[in-house]
Interface confidence: medium
């Protein structure tokens, strides 16, 4: 079996996690992609996903999560803005490829969010001069209901009722139409 590797990010409340997941261009460019959280002993929960088929560099926003799929570069950009301590956890990017199980992209991301104003860009409103505007047309894409049992971290759930739908995600409050976000973190 492939060893599951993790990358750890330690950020302060209010900062932005800004990471990318690489994928094989030819194979997955237009495939639907998702950002998931993995809780111990549970199936991965899908927090946000791109449209189906995935649109090139078209931002999809779900609460404080913004996904952008750069087809020409084989990367999915994932941002979680205004981080909260409760956002700490293990995350992964996956590619939906029905009828097969989702394909997991490496590495997983171990996010540690700690309290306290960091004073670093991403933590407040003047973090960057370029204002990133979420287009008003940005919609919440419908995400498939299935997840992969291969990514369970401990025991699998007792029944399929534990598999989350997009509406039973962790609580991510909505942000305003204008979000100032850093580029590198």
């Amino acid at each position: 079996a492939t060893k599951l590797t993790e990358e750890k990010y330690e950020l302060k409340e209010g900062q932005t996690l800004d990471v990318k997941c690489d994928y094989t261009l030819e194979k997955f460019a237009s495939s639907q992609k998702a950002w998931q959280i993995i809780r111990d002993g549970e199936m991965p929960k899908t927090l946000a996903c791109t449209e189906r088929p995935s649109k090139n560099s078209h931002p999809v926003q779900v609460g404080r999560i913004i996904l952008e799929d750069y087809h020409d570069h084989g990367l999915l950009r994932v941002r979680m803005v205004n981080l909260q301590v409760e956002d700490s956890g293990l995350y992964q990017c996956v590619i939906y490829q029905p009828p097969k199980e989702p394909h997991m992209l490496f590495d997983r991301i171990r996010l540690v969010v700690t309290k306290g104003f960091s004073g670093t860009p991403g933590s407040n409103e003047n973090s960057t001069q370029n204002v990133y505007k979420i287009p008003p047309t940005t919609t919440k894409a419908l995400c498939p209901l299935y997840t992969s049992p291969r990514t369970v971290t401990q025991a699998p759930p007792k029944s399929t009722a534990d598999v989350s739908t997009p509406d039973s995600e962790i609580n991510l409050t909505n942000v305003t139409d204008i979000i100032r976000v850093p580029v590198f973190n």
Epitope: E7, Y9, Q15, H73, S127, N130, V183, F184, N185
Partner: antibody, heavy 127, light 107 residues
Framework: QVQLVQSGAEVKKPGSSVKVSCKAS????????ISWVRQAPGQGLEWMGG????????NYAQKFQGRVTIAADEPTSTTYMELRSLRSEDTAVYYC????????????????????WGQGTTVTVSS | DIQMTQSPTSLSASVGDRVTITCRAS??????LAWYQQKPEKAPKSLIY???SLQSGVPSRFSGSGSGTDFTLTISSLQPEDFATYYC?????????FGQGTRLEIK
């Protein structure tokens, strides 16, 4: 691997602006993040800001916020750093540096550390 | 901002010596740390990224270790060309910050 070539030395008056360019060659321009770092005479390194050309948005250190603009021109693979309202303490060597952030199996982070540096541009601010 | 503190600030050593430079972050930065070497009138050169990964083309006598807040750069056997100033740098979060530098001189 990408190479970075910077524009030549500049002598400026206090209150004026300077625009330094950094041209990349030998790599895919928008697969890198470009940072600007300065070093005053006899001092250490100070990060000013950076840009990922693919995404277009720049980010700046709070100290330089409102006084610096970093921009990228993809067709010419060139990044620019403009510093306004110059004062004598801005006298320094200004470096651009590239961070490779793309590739299968690489880090999820965009920013790796500054793996390739330009030769530096000396900016002297004097009346 | 994350403060990076290097020690010592200067160091005298001889060719063949084993040298260790430490860098401490004011808060946890996982493994998001890089080390650079700079010689007078030259641009810095990247030695180590992600705390312990050697940049391509850098001699294996250079090594890095640590995670969280405490990091170390080790030169196992000093060569004449290694006398320079060394900087650590964090890139866990903005603003990216450097240590104040460690000047390595010939004894």
């Amino acid at each position: 691997q990408v190479q970075l070539v910077q524009s030549g030395a500049e002598v400026k008056k206090p209150g004026s602006s300077v625009k330094v360019s950094c041209k990349a060659s030998g790599g895919t321009f928008n697969r890198h993040a470009i940072s600007w770092v300065r070093q005053a005479p006899g001092q250490g390194l100070e990060w000013m800001g950076g840009i990922i050309p693919l995404f277009g948005t720049a980010n700046y250190a709070q100290k330089f916020q409102g006084r610096v603009t970093i921009a990228a021109d993809e067709p010419t693979s060139t990044t620019y750093m403009e510093l306004r309202s110059l004062r004598s303490e801005d006298t320094a060597v200004y470096y651009c540096a590239s961070s490779y952030f793309y590739g299968s199996g690489s880090s999820n982070y965009y920013y790796y550390g500054l793996d390739v540096w330009g030769q530096g541009t000396t900016v002297t601010v004097s009346s | 901002d994350i403060q990076m503190t290097q020690s010592p600030t200067s160091l005298s050593a001889s060719v063949g010596d084993r040298v260790t430079i430490t860098c401490r972050a004011s808060q946890g930065i996982s493994s998001w740390l890089a080390w650079y070497q700079q010689k007078p009138e030259k641009a810095p050169k990247s030695l180590i990224y992600a705390a312990s990964s050697l940049q391509s083309g850098v001699p294996s006598r250079f090594s890095g270790s640590g995670s969280g807040t405490d990091f170390t750069l080790t030169i196992s056997s000093l060569q004449p060309e290694d006398f320079a100033t060394y900087y650590c740098q964090q890139y866990n979060s903005y603003p990216i910050t450097f240590g104040q530098g460690t000047r390595l001189e010939i004894k």
